[in-house]
């Protein structure tokens, strides 16, 4: 009879055991355990009858289809074999051990007691077959086994090849290299591989193998393992295989497909190819003259590109364009984008015209181009280049007037100062009355007049004031404060200011510049009460022209001292301190009791002690501060009187030979003009210089020159 | 014509506030000043202070900065003094007046429980 | 404050006469600057606004008849009405404007 097993382990004992077997006696087990498991069997008992190749009795051990052992007896002979100690394995998971005794038995004889187990199969070892081993990586578990494949494969639906992804791989430079995955190690099997060249229409693809060709192949069949086909629009070359590469390919078309196929077995180290991208032809190209192509080759395809550039001084002219550089290129149909341009001679073109200055050619024809050279000078001498630049500027390579200081700023001409048209009179002669002065011998001399038309009636004054550039007026804070009611500080309104420049004689305006003011700036510490800080200053609405009635005046250097005691100096105005006098009758021009033409004095300045002392001994509250200076004389006369409010007290600068403004008309004592002791007093500009240029917006070293040379 | 139109009389409890207009036509209102004037029967003229519209500039007389308030509306040329704190002290006559040469018609002012 | 004082406060003439009256400043009200003299001159008729008559102490204002006259400087001035007509009852008031404004007590004048 047949007994069927399925436990995992299990005791086997002859019928009867450990009493003798019966004779005549056949039992079958049968023992199956789970796939990935074999049978171990081992004997602790064996004690069968003895027989030639047990003949008689015997415990047999088998598979399916192969017998494993036949035992009998109870010692080991030529003959016959007991298990004794050895241990019978199945190969798989089944074991049939069969028991059979004869039909007598000469002794008495125990039969056999055996154990089984199911024992773990190491796959992963004892696999030797490449058709079921592992392709990368193998891991033993109890009652099976696995594959997993390196980084960068996939595992086969096979689950034991490792195959890679490589349907996705689109080639579009001119250029390039396409292997077999992990080339030069075998590459994987059981792979599909799609390599796509897509190269621009008006290419051809040139595919050439190189190095290793190791494609798995058949001696017989072509090619029914592994194979590269390539294919070219409807037409497929191949398929290749074996070691010998194919010869290099001109597939005449923008677009190539690769396909590799690779299957589930085989060790070969596969291919490598390089694709080359190869066009139409273009014509030779010749480079214009004064100019060269870049890159310089024997020959151009399409798509190559050529930069034509031109000689420096001379710009790349394309369809009356001109350029840096112009860009060309070689199209499929082996013709260029564009024919070679010319180069032209760079022109700078007409100078920019340069305000109060002139512009010299040294070239001769008044030429512009490229290298080409012009001066710029200033009107002299109302107008000087500042910081003595040369003036002369080169056509440059970019197109543009250069000079080596300015670069391609234009210089500038700055109003010269202190250099009157007439040279004032000798200071070697006292002046003690006023006279006349000729035209041009105060060209900063400046008639403000101011209407206040927010009154009823309109309430107009005037007073002086001093050039000092082309935009700006110096003046007194007391001219140009609005009139309130209170003790305020509040600047007139612009629109309510005219100043009028180069007036001579006040009933002929026609020769004079008259000028709205853009911004009235009073100084911000001006006290109303005892006219310190008594100056403020003027924007003209438009920059006026110099010339020899109107130049501007210098300014003092920074000097808290002031003008030196008893040093000479000229004030001028038309006399309209007059207080009988009407600014009506002024402006019309239509009275006698002023004068119309321009007067001028001749006053020495005052100790400080002294002009202080003279104040303070009136009564009233006068008070001659530190940045107020007097002039005058002790014996009075009418001259101190001259000159309106806020105009300028010059003295010749010896060191710059020029004529600076270092006081402006403020105020003076109660008593009538020219009396005894009654000096006039000055607001002292040294002490305001800093304020002055900041307010202009100047930098100091701008204009310091023009005093200090 | 130049003209100063003023608002008509108010009659007014002590510490209340009263606003008097003076609307000006025939002339560019924005650039002369509006001066306003106090006047009371036995005490003769006193001068409050002045704006000028266009800039919104004021002067007070000291006496009357915690008293009046002066404001102008330039889109329909008006000017205002605001009179605040009332007491019968400021029962009066109010002129407002184009910068000395033109009066307003005045507003006359009663303070009275 | 400027102070202003009108002499005499009220004065009777009979029409046709001439008639002067006074007023003093406490300050100078010449102006340095603009060179002018902040006294002006209203004529207050009986139920009337004032009326300017004289600015910068001697200008005539446009429309005023020229029997008004004002003069003086520094800080005396008079206003003059070289002969007095009925329509001139009023009371006359003078205002310096060289700083905060302020006006003098006034002048009556009654027609006999």
């Known amino acids: 009879h047949t007994v069927e097993l399925n436990n995992m382990f299990g005791q086997i004992q002859s019928p009867g055991y450990p009493d003798s077997y019966p004779s005549d006696s056949e039992v079958t087990w049968n023992i199956t355990v789970p796939d990935g498991f074999r049978i171990k069997l081992y004997f602790m008992h064996f004690n069968l009858e003895s027989s030639y190749l047990c003949e008689y009795d015997y415990v047999k051990v088998e598979t399916e289809d192969q017998v494993l052992a036949t035992f009998c007896g109870r010692e080991t002979t030529d003959t016959e074999q007991t298990p004794g100690q050895e241990v019978v394995l199945s190969p798989g998971s089944f074991m049939s051990i069969t028991f059979r005794s004869d039909f007598s038995n000469e002794e008495r004889f125990t039969g056999f007691d055996a154990h089984y187990m199911a024992v773990d199969v190491d796959e992963c070892k004892e696999r030797e077959d490449e058709e079921l081993s592992c392709d990368h990586y193998c891991h033993n578990y109890i009652g099976g086994y696995y594959c997993s494949c390196r980084f960068g494969y996939i595992l086969h639906t096979d689950n034991r090849t490792c195959r890679v992804e490589c349907s996705d791989n689109l080639f579009t430079q001119r250029t390039g290299v396409i292997t077999s995955p992990d080339f030069p190690n075998p590459y994987p099997k059981s792979s599909e591989c799609l390599y796509t060249i897509e190269l621009e229409e008006g290419f051809m693809v040139n595919l050439q193998f190189e190095d290793i060709f190791d494609i798995e192949d058949h001696p017989e069949v072509p090619c029914p393992y592994d194979y590269i086909k390539i294919k070219v629009g409807p037409k497929v070359l191949g398929p290749f295989c074996g070691e010998k590469a194919p010869e290099p390919i001109s597939t005449q078309s923008h677009s190539v497909l690769i396909l590799f196929h690779s299957d589930n077995s085989g060790e070969n180290r596969g291919w490598r190819l390089s694709y080359r991208a190869a066009g139409n032809e273009c014509p030779e190209l010749q480079p214009p003259v004064h100019g060269k192509i870049e890159p310089s080759q024997a020959k151009y395809f399409f798509k190559d590109q050529v930069l034509v550039s031109c000689d420096t001084g001379y710009k790349v002219l394309k369809d009356n364009v001109e350029m840096d550089t112009f860009q060309i290129e070689c199209l499929k149909d082996g013709t260029w984008s564009n024919k070679i341009p010319t180069c032209k001679i760079v022109d700078c073109r007409a100078p920019g015209e340069l305000e109060h200055g002139l512009i010299t050619f040294s070239t001769r024809n008044n030429l512009t181009t490229y290298k080409s050279e012009i001066k710029y000078s200033c009107q002299e001498p109302y107008y000087k280049m500042l910081n003595n630049n040369t003036g002369i500027y080169t056509c440059s390579a970019q197109g543009v007037w250069m000079n080596k200081v300015l670069g391609r700023s234009l210089p500038t001409c700055l109003p010269e100062c202190g250099q009157p048209s007439r040279s004032l009179p000798s200071l070697v002669k006292r002046i003690i009355g006023g006279r006349n002065a000729e035209p041009g011998l105060f060209p900063w001399q400046a008639l403000i007049v101011v209407e206040d038309t927010s009154r009823v009636p309109n309430d107009k004054w005037f007073g002086s004031g001093a050039l000092l550039s082309a935009s700006w007026i110096l003046t007194a804070a007391h001219v140009l404060r609005s009139q309130r009611r209170d003790t305020t500080v509040i600047p007139v309104s612009k629109e309510h200011v005219t100043v009028y420049l180069g007036l001579h004689d006040v009933r002929d305006k026609s020769g004079a510049v008259n000028s709205s003011a853009a911004r009235v700036v009073l100084h911000p510490d001006f006290n109303i009460q005892n006219y310190n800080h008594d100056i403020a200053l003027v924007q003209l609405q438009e920059p006026v022209p110099l010339g020899p009635h109107v130049m501007p005046v210098c300014l003092p250097r920074l000097e808290p001292e002031g003008p030196a005691p008893h040093m000479l100096g000229l004030v001028a105005g038309w006399g309209i301190s007059n207080p009988n006098v009407t600014v009506d009758e002024i402006i019309s021009s239509g009275t006698r009791t002023l004068s119309d033409v321009l007067q001028y004095v001749k006053l020495p300045v005052v100790p400080h002690a002294e002009c202080k002392t003279s104040y303070e001994s009136r009564s009233g509250n006068y008070s001659v501060t530190e940045n107020m200076f007097c002039a005058g004389y002790y014996e009075g006369g009418k001259d101190t009187c001259l000159g309106d409010s806020g105009g300028a007290f010059v003295i010749f600068d010896d060191l710059s030979q020029r004529w600076v403004v270092q006081g402006l008309v403020s105020w003076g004592g109660p008593e009538e003009c020219g009396s005894k002791q009654v000096y006039g007093v000055y607001t002292k500009v040294s002490n305001y210089v800093d304020w002055v240029w900041e307010q202009m917006g100047l930098p100091q070293s701008v204009v310091e020159p023009q005093v200090e040379r | 014509e130049v003209q100063l139109q003023q608002s008509g009389a108010e009659l007014v409890k002590p510490g209340a506030s009263v606003k008097i207009s003076c609307k000006a036509s025939g002339y560019t209102f924005t650039g002369k000043w509006i001066e306003w004037v106090k006047q009371r029967p036995g005490h003769g003229l006193e001068w409050i202070g002045e704006i000028l519209p266009g800039s919104g500039s004021t002067d007070y007389n000291e006496r009357f900065k915690d008293k009046a308030t002066f404001t102008a509306d330039t889109s329909s040329n008006t000017a205002y003094m605001q009179l605040t704190s009332l007491t019968p002290d400021d029962s009066a006559t109010y002129y407002c007046?184009?910068?000395?040469?033109?009066w307003g018609s005045g507003t006359t002012l009663t303070v009275s429980s | 404050d400027v102070v202003m004082t009108q002499t005499p406060s009220s004065l009777a003439v009979s029409a046709g006469e001439k008639v002067t009256m006074s007023c003093k400043s406490s300050?100078?009200?010449?102006?340095?600057?603009?060179?002018?003299?902040?006294l002006a001159w209203y004529q207050q008729k009986p139920g009337q606004s004032p009326k300017l008559l004289i600015y910068w102490a001697s200008t005539r204002e446009s429309g005023v008849p020229d029997r008004f006259t004002g003069s003086g400087s520094g800080t005396d001035f008079t206003l003059t009405i070289s002969s007095v007509q009925a329509e001139d009852l009023a009371i006359y008031y003078c205002k310096q404007s060289y700083t905060l404004p302020t006006f003098g007590g006034g002048t009556k004048l009654e027609i006999k």
């Open positions: 007046v184009r910068s000395e040469d033109l």
């Open positions: 300050q100078s009200l010449l102006n340095s600057v603009t060179r002018k003299t902040y």
